[in-house]
């Protein structure tokens, strides 16, 4: 029952150009190229995109023209391999060009860099941005796509088109406003934060598909869509899952034109069939395509249908469970996950997947036992501790968050995670712990029924960031173990890690704790990052330091920064007071 067109096209590139239109075609090819060749200058990419676009137009005019029958991977790969500086800029990635498709594309995918060595994007003055926008709107927006795509090589391409549309709207509106900055800056901040979140969410989907396979992704999708569309029947959910899996497989595989086209088809199908899917889709379906797709992806859960009987009858109490399981394994387990998820919008997706895995494991064991029914009769009792563990963890951490506030809560997590995995680089520990800490303000405000899906599924996204960053430069067996053993048990695995007793404390380096007057001109966020970087380094030097010791040092540090930033001769203050602070801290921590 897939919605996607199966008819063969003589020219795939012509087909996609006609389906998507020139503007979206060019934008998606630019995103694809920037996600593959992350170091190439903007102008080089624009040139390549223009060449591909001109070629596509010749194929639209005549699908039988030379090379028009080639696959998109062949066409795009050939184009990427024309880049003159490939070996100098990308090193061994140039070897991909010696391969044939599909190995060449797989090779490019393997070289995508989650943490490319690119300068931080600095936002120019508002007037400068507005001038650039008015001077050449098209180039300005292309540059936005390019800069985001190269820094986020797994960004969900059709969603990036939606962000670009909002980016354009912000400039169109605000560059005419009386107070341009007041209008524009909050919008850009919102787009930046939403963009980072969107990128991280998509990165988890791609990791799920690439590291754990299609079955893992489909299980995640069944659980999530069943929560979101509890009135939809199993066949409908299964169909949506199949189509959604195809869309994300394509995007994660670099097939961005197919992905965007299929996503549009899926949105169309959902809106044409909303009566049998969800009562919450009406507003989404009235929007234009990009907004519609985004809206559907974020739509709130529909109300649970009335009259749902207990699951125990079919999945525990029946003596025919093993027969049903043996003869229709995937349907039976899929139905179990669907039925459980639609009844539990209050559970995280990862918890639902743990329950389904526990159920499957129990059936595997019990259906081979002498008395299967007696063996599996108490399977739902095994769920209780699995449900209570995240509930208790969230309760404790929300209490801590409410007591400390976001910054100090992040600090508590920084200390906790540095002690667990001190080998991980300081920037990664700071970034990940700061994001973990944001769970407080994101989720603790919710009522009990919404806390777990908010918190634990968000933590899965953040811990995946740690996993992909660590995979690039592996330094900790414990991180590797938690990241690779089970996708759904990553969070419990990290939660269960205690202090790493094998860690040899880092040598003390005074330079790490030397600060200068430039800290005073930083934004509050940047200042926090500086302090949190110092905190991680402290813990790496003294992993056995108590909370109280660390708090005392950090309080002294905050007072030191505040004092020197108020001083007339800031640099002298930082030099002299800094030495005293380092000495006092060493004494306090017994370094």
């Amino acid at each position: 029952r897939g919605v996607f067109r199966r008819d063969a096209h003589k020219s795939e590139v012509a087909h996609r150009f006609k389906d998507l239109g020139e503007e979206n075609f060019k934008a998606l090819v630019l995103i694809a190229f920037a996600q593959y060749l992350q170091q190439c200058p903007f102008e080089d990419h624009v040139k390549l995109v223009n060449e591909v676009t001109e070629f596509a137009k010749t194929c639209v005019a005549d699908e039988s023209a030379e090379n028009c029958d080639k696959s998109l991977h062949t066409l795009f790969g050939d184009k990427l391999c024309t880049v003159a500086t490939l070996r100098e800029t990308y090193g061994e990635m140039a070897d991909c060009c010696a391969k044939q498709e599909p190995e060449r594309n797989e090779c490019f995918l393997q070289h995508k860099d989650d943490n490319p060595n690119l300068p931080r994007l600095v936002r120019p003055e508002v007037d400068v941005m507005c001038t650039a926008f008015h001077d050449n709107e098209e180039t300005f927006l292309k540059k936005y796509l390019y800069e985001i795509a190269r820094r986020h090589p797994y960004f969900y391409a059709p969603e990036l088109l939606f962000f670009a549309k909002r980016y354009k709207a912000a400039f169109t509106e605000c560059c005419q406003a009386a107070d341009k900055a007041a209008c524009l800056l909050p919008k850009l901040d919102e787009l930046r934060d939403e963009g980072k979140a969107s990128s991280a969410k998509q990165r988890l989907k791609c990791a799920s598909l690439q590291k754990f396979g299609e079955r893992a992704f489909k299980a995640w999708a069944v659980a999530r869509l069943s929560q979101r569309f509890p009135k939809a029947e199993f066949a409908e959910v299964s169909k949506l899952v199949t189509d959604l899996t195809k869309v994300h497989t394509e995007c994660c595989h670099g097939d961005l034109l197919e992905c965007a086209d299929d996503r549009a088809d899926l949105a169309k199908y959902i809106c044409e069939n909303q009566d049998s899917i969800s009562s919450k889709l009406k507003e989404c379906c009235e929007k234009p395509l990009l907004e519609k797709s985004h809206c559907i992806a974020e739509v709130e859960n529909d109300e649970m249908p009335a009259d749902l009987p207990s699951l125990a009858a079919d999945f525990v109490e029946s003596k025919d469970v093993c027969k049903n399981y043996a003869e229709a394994k995937d349907v039976f387990l899929g139905m179990f996950l669907y039925e459980y998820a639609r009844r539990h919008p209050d559970y995280s997706v990862v918890l639902l997947l743990r329950l389904a895995k526990t159920y499957e494991t129990t059936l595997e064991k019990c259906c081979a036992a002498a008395d299967p029914h007696e063996c599996y009769a108490k399977v739902f009792d095994e769920f209780k501790p699995l449900v209570e563990e995240p509930q208790n963890l969230i309760k404790q951490n929300c209490e801590l968050f409410e007591q400390l506030g976001e910054y100090k809560f992040q600090n508590a997590l920084l200390v906790r995670y540095t002690k667990k995995v001190p080998q991980v680089s300081t920037p990664t520990l700071v970034e990940v712990s700061r994001n973990l800490g944001k769970v407080g303000s994101k989720c603790c405000k919710h009522p009990e029924a919404k806390r777990m899906p908010c918190a634990e599924d968000y933590l899965s996204v953040v811990l995946n960031q740690l996993c992909v960053l660590h995979e690039k430069t592996p330094v900790s067996d414990r991180v590797t173990k938690c990241c690779t053993e089970s996708l759904v048990n990553r969070r419990p695995c990290f939660s269960a890690l205690e202090v790493d007793e094998t860690y040899v404390p880092k040598e003390f380096n005074a330079e790490t704790f030397t600060f200068h007057a430039d800290i005073c001109t930083l934004s509050e966020k940047e200042r926090q990052i500086k302090k949190q970087t110092a905190l991680v380094e402290l813990v790496k030097h003294k992993p056995k330091a108590t909370k109280e010791q660390l708090k005392a040092v950090m309080d002294d540090f905050a007072a030191f920064v505040e004092k020197c930033c108020k001083a007339d001769d800031k640099e002298t203050c930082f030099a002299e007071e800094g030495k005293k602070l380092v000495a006092a801290s060493q004494a306090a921590l017994g370094l």
């Epitope: 066949a235 009858a313 999945f315 029946s318 003596k319 003869e327 229709a328 039976f332």
Partner: antibody, heavy 120, light 108 residues
Framework: EVQLVESGGGLVQPGGSLRLSCAAS????????MNWVRQAPGKCLEWIGH???????YYATWAKGRFTISRDNSKNTVYLQMNSLRAEDTAVYFC??????????????WGQGTLVTVSS | AFELTQSPSSLSASVGDRVTITCQAS??????LAWYQQKPGQPPKLLIY???DLTSGVPSRFSGSGSGTDFTLTISSLQPEDFATYYC??????????FGCGTKLTVL
């Protein structure tokens, strides 16, 4: 509109065969266990059997051998094949939808029924 | 397979009366019992499932209770439209299901 419509009933001679159909609209049969229930004139409800979402059919002890349930998902229809019919098989035959794909009950959705008369 | 015994098989009552119908299973079926109402020429209508859960749209004068082997359907105050035949159904112990033989409720 979500509904079930039975058809194929009628007069049949003892020893004869009949195939009843139950066409579903407004939902997909493949998501549910689909049941056949009968009721002889002025008598109790009697469950015949069902076919579940895994395409596994189960029958009441008395129905095994003579009655076969199948379905065609593309036609969104479930069937009841009845062989070696006897006078005591005279009844209104209902099709009913289970609560889930592997459910034996409860049945919230029923068809209006089709009358089967076995007589010479 | 288990059997369900419904009692009484027939019952006469007046509008406003409180009526109780019982259903006994030959073995424990936990809470897996449903109650149906059937009127002549119509299919059964689900009233109660899982022994005590009221189906949406069914008046609250209908209630169910019990678990294991003994179950009851109670109509707290009979209304004219309640005169019909009531069936219990046990399910969930296997992939088969059983109906009781009905209680015919008539006007006194």
């Amino acid at each position: 509109e979500v509904q079930l419509v039975e058809s194929g009933g009628g007069l049949v001679q003892p020893g004869g065969s009949l195939r009843l159909s139950c066409a579903a609209s407004g939902f997909s049969l493949s998501s549910y266990a689909m049941n056949w229930v009968r009721q002889a004139p002025g008598k109790c409800l009697e469950w015949i059997g069902h076919i579940n979402a895994g395409d596994i059919a189960y029958y009441a002890t008395w129905a095994k051998g003579r009655f076969t349930i199948s379905r065609d998902n593309s036609k969104n229809t479930v069937y009841l094949q009845m062989n070696s019919l006897r006078a005591e098989d005279t009844a209104v035959y209902f099709c009913a939808r289970g609560a889930g794909g592997f459910s034996t009950g409860p049945f919230k959705l029923w068809g209006q029924g089709t009358l089967v008369t076995v007589s010479s | 397979a288990f059997e369900l015994t419904q009692s009484p098989s027939s019952l006469s009552a007046s509008v406003g009366d409180r009526v109780t119908i019982t259903c006994q299973a030959s073995e424990s079926i936990n809470s897996r019992l449903a109650w149906y109402q059937q009127k002549p020429g119509q299919p059964p209508k689900l009233l109660i499932y899982d022994a005590s859960d009221l189906t949406s749209g069914v008046p609250s004068r209908f209630s169910g209770s019990g678990s294991g082997t003994d179950f009851t359907l109670t109509i707290s105050s009979l209304q004219p439209e309640d005169f019909a035949t009531y069936y219990c159904q046990g399910y969930g112990g296997s992939s088969t299901t059983t109906f009781g033989c009905g209680t015919k409720l008539t006007v006194l």
